[in-house]
Interface confidence: medium
Amino acid sequence: SQVSQNCHNGSYEISVLMMGNSAFAEPLKNLEDAVNEGLEIVRGRLQNAGLNVTVNATFMYSDGLIHNSGDCRSSTCEGLDLLRKISNAQRMGCVLIGPSCTYSTFQMYLDTELSYPMISAGSFGLSCDYKETLTRLMSPARKLMYFLVNFWKTNDLPFKTYSWSTSYVYKNGTETEDCFWYLNALEASVSYFSHELGFKVVLRQDKEFQDILMDHNRKSNVIIMCGGPEFLYKLKGDRAVAEDIVIILVDLFNDQYFEDNVTAPDYMKNVLVLTLSPGNSLLNSSFSRNLSPTKRDFALAYLNGILLFGHMLKIFLENGENITTPKFAHAFRNLTFEGYDGPVTLDDWGDVDSTMVLLYTSVDTKKYKVLLTYDTHVNKTYPVDMSPTFTWKNSKLPNDITGRGPQ
């Protein structure tokens, strides 16, 4: 049925889906607070621009009776049920902020006539790539793949003189939502990562992973996994590791590595951690701007979703353009807007760009140090530490295949 959008005559509403099944176990109250904080900022920005309009959010909660797994497994139906709720109420905002699970976003995108933009904090999977009216404010799997391929091919840095073409991927099925889709993308036989690698095997059992660490007949020295240091320790423990093994630990949404008092445990010495640059968030508190810290990336993505809507609303209103048009629905991409803690860039397909940071453990200081950074917007790697104090021989990353060239 035709749903009218509450999106004109100076009154602009945001529909926020508050789903029980979510990419991250963040209390819905925190997400509400993030949205409300975003609304305050948007109202201020619109007022400063001389635009006397009303912007509000409507929170749409599911009943939680059927879809109560808490994770993303039953999110497909929950998302569609919430859309049905909107349809029955005959009321939709200018924009839909909500589904974070890949399953629900994919299905909702398929099953709705999207004449309005959809903003997601999540939807990491490749199946949500290249969607014309979907914007994703947390790094999707495609961005991770492009970094990995770029890094694998790099061979002209003082600390990486070999191109790599092989990898093991550890994926045991217990991963968080982000990790599940990141590893899913690496596993997929038709993905860019698989296409560019000559050898790739998925390890699904703890024992398979543990055996590879000292297996003289292993086909690759590189193992990719996803999670935090504790996750790695549970799996690896204090087992001996061959000296030319490199574990790439994908842990994008974790700021702990940048905290001053953090010391890297010994089991991290063979590990390169891939995380996101903390951006401006560590700097805000030193300035007189009275911004309450929204540390978690998930809640921050909700907040930035509100700010993105405010940014687009301001542009369209200043240009005298209609908000309830396909042009508005397709406009949430290829732009930079002022996020809560700095500029946020969206690529041509509405996916957030960011600075990924590859960290190593200094054998001297036992601290995490930045080895290089990678700008997803320009697909470019920038070396930072040209003479890292690695655990690996000659302070260089080994070849990915044992016995191929000098180690």
């Epitope: 640059s277 700095g342 500029p343 950074t373 917007h377 320009v378 920038y382 930072v384 530490d385």
Partner: nanobody
Framework: QVQLVESGGGLVQPGGSLRLSCAAS????????MSWVRQAPGKGLEWVAK????????YYVDSVKGRFTISRDNAKNSVYLQMNSLRAEDTGVYYC????????WGQGTTVTVSS
């Protein structure tokens, strides 16, 4: 390689002025906020000022508001700090920093305010 090179420090009398410069290389300068940070003798680091990637927003720590001005020239990959009405408490080593990565620091430039 990511590099930041500061210059322009020196000895100046109270009430005097200095202009600090920072030349950046090895990253897409025009996409990142830049900051000036200082370390007074025997003290910790203090964030002084920061500027948005396009120069349209600037923030200052309270103690320098109205006296210091941060600016940038994206064509030259440079950020500047114009310091007027200098006081003895502004003495220290001044560093520029980028939100691109926290691990890169220049050698700093020393500012001494003394009569």
């Amino acid at each position: 390689q990511v590099q930041l090179v500061e210059s322009g420090g020196g000895l100046v009398q109270p009430g005097g002025s200095l202009r600090l410069s920072c030349a950046a290389s090895g990253f897409t300068f025009s996409r990142y906020w830049m900051s000036w940070v200082r370390q007074a003798p025997g003290k910790g680091l203090e964030w002084v000022a920061k500027i948005k990637y396009d120069g349209s927003e600037k923030y200052y720590v309270d103690s320098v508001k109205g006296r210091f001005t941060i600016s940038r020239d994206n064509a030259k990959n440079s950020v500047y700090l114009q310091m007027n009405s200098l006081r003895a408490e502004d003495t220290g080593v001044y560093y520029c920093a980028t939100d691109f990565t926290r691990d890169v620091w220049g050698q700093g430039t020393t500012v001494t305010v003394s009569s």
